[in-house]
């Protein structure tokens, strides 16, 4: 890995290695232009595998709400609008962190939690087993 | 909003309102029994739209390493392997949290940051703009 | 033990409304269709409509658009609302599991059949 | 829509016969295609996936094969359960569409 010097002007920490604890300013700072890529976009509805947007609530994480993917068709949509069935439509997932409340319902106390999202879809071909 | 009761057991905190600074323990629970569904899952190379995953590593950033992908080619791929262009393979982006080291290279204390990367691609009809 | 099992059926007459449903049990809605399928006195096969519950999509066959209403409950209930019915519905309807048949990504097919 | 055709409509067999179907696609449907057994009433049973690929519990006398546009369905050697109606099935794409059936009858 990359040893970074350390800056004299960081807060005093009790353990001097990367920390277990640390102190986190939850002033986002966005780095995108764009505050709502799913929104602007209407790629769910013109993917040949689209998908519909579930939101997914939990006071006790941060962020509270995400948006989960769910594949409309099992196959995928073809030039004349039907399913091709030889053809699957599959969910593109992401492991994403988020902040858990821990202890429960403590508002300045967190832990670091990995979380598997469903983003979009998008349209495999079929790993085809014959089965003699 | 949901209020939630606080619990008596929360570490101390000068605000008791939603904070701005608060403490994160990076002991990271994973919820996910898959730990890295995109090595495990061949869809960038079985998709339509298929996408190469290129390393994005920031030794300021935590997560230090994030996989972006970019989409292989302009159109999508058709039954005969051949690129289609009257299709296009589109990025799916999606915004995530990811702690800064701020100070710089401090390693006790951080600012959540928001940034947009891209998951994967999926296929979508083009939107034809016809010139008068 | 996956199971599919029919109700709802009965004599109506012309331009009348019948409600087929159709419990299902024993795997997960996420990986297949309930299509129904009927078949006409001394007659073949034909597919009605079908849905994909878990990602909200329904596909009925020309014969039926706007007719017929295919539906699903969070309990695994798929039901067939027909409206306007008319003498070429009657038939006999079956209610059958649609999808990879087995683990494997395998070609799809109608796997499991109500009585 | 892909249209499915079946030969024979029916065909007449003694048990012990080798008996062959055939179903042919309007188009071509690689090897989409299902095989169905079907008694009088009662619900259609699948024999047959992925044209050559046998459904659980289905005997090994029951064999498909081909791909693209021509599928064969052949019971090696007939036995008494197996007088019934076969239907093909194309699951390429929507709308799903079965062939008009095949019976076959005792001799």
């Known amino acids: 890995g990359i040893t970074i010097p350390r800056n004299p002007g960081c807060p005093n920490s009790e353990d001097k290695n990367f920390p277990r604890t640390v102190m986190v300013n939850l002033n986002i700072h966005n780095r995108n232009t764009n505050t709502n890529p799913k929104r602007s976009s209407d790629y769910y509805n013109r993917s040949t595998s689209p998908w519909n947007l579930h939101r997914n609530e939990d006071p006790e994480r941060y962020p509270s709400v995400i948006w989960e993917a769910k594949c409309r068709h099992l196959g995928c949509i073809n030039a004349d609008g039907n399913v091709d069935y030889h053809m699957n439509s599959v969910p593109i997932q992401q492991e994403i962190l988020v902040l858990r409340r821990e202890p429960p319902h403590c508002p300045n106390s967190f832990r670091l939690e990995k979380i598997l999202v469903s983003v979009g879809c998008t349209c495999v071909t079929p790993i085809v087993h014959h089965v003699a | 909003g949901i209020t939630i009761p606080r619990n008596p057991g929360c570490p101390n905190s000068e605000d008791k309102n939603f904070p701005r600074t608060v403490m994160v323990n990076l002991n990271i629970h994973n919820r996910n029994t898959n730990t890295n569904p995109k090595r495990s899952s061949d869809y960038y190379n079985r998709s339509t739209s298929p996408w190469n995953l290129h390393r994005n590593e920031d030794p300021e950033r935590y997560p230090s390493v994030i996989w972006e992908a970019k989409c292989r080619h302009l159109g999508c791929i058709n039954a005969d392997g051949n690129v289609d262009y009257h299709m296009n393979s589109v990025p799916i982006q999606q915004e995530i949290l990811v702690l800064r080291r701020e100070p710089p290279h401090c390693p006790n204390s951080f600012r959540l940051e928001k940034i947009l990367v891209s998951v994967g691609c999926t296929c979508v009809t083009p939107i034809v703009h016809h010139v008068a | 033990e996956v199971q599919l099992v029919e109700s709802g059926g009965g004599l109506v007459q012309p331009g009348g409304s019948l409600r087929l449903s159709c419990a299902a049990s024993g795997f997960s809605f996420s990986s297949y269709e309930i299509s129904w399928v009927r078949q006409a006195p001394g007659k073949g096969l034909e597919w009605v409509s079908s849905i994909y519950a878990y990602g909200g999509s329904t596909y009925y066959a020309d014969s039926v658009k706007g007719r017929f209403t295919i539906s699903a409950d969070t309990s695994k209930n798929t039901a067939l609302q027909m409206n306007s019915l008319r003498a070429e519905d009657t038939a006999v309807y079956y209610c059958?599991?649609?999808?990879?048949?087995?683990?494997?990504k395998t070609q799809p097919a109608m796997d499991v059949w109500g009585q | 829509d892909i249209q499915m055709t079946q030969s024979p409509s029916s065909l007449s067999a003694s048990v012990g016969d080798r008996v062959t179907i055939t179903c042919r696609a309007s188009q071509s449907i690689s090897s989409y295609l299902a095989w169905y057994q079907q008694k009088p009433g009662k619900a259609p049973k699948l024999l047959i996936y992925g044209a050559s690929s046998r459904a659980s519990g289905v005997p090994s006398r029951f064999s498909g094969s081909g791909s693209g546009t021509d599928f064969t369905l052949t019971i090696s050697s007939l036995q008494p359960e197996d007088f019934a109606t076969y239907y093909c099935?194309?699951?390429?794409?929507?709308?799903?569409?079965f062939g008009q059936g095949t019976k076959v009858e005792i001799k």
């Open positions: 059958a599991r649609f999808g990879m048949y087995s683990r494997w």
């Open positions: 099935q194309q699951s390429y794409s929507s709308p799903l569409t």
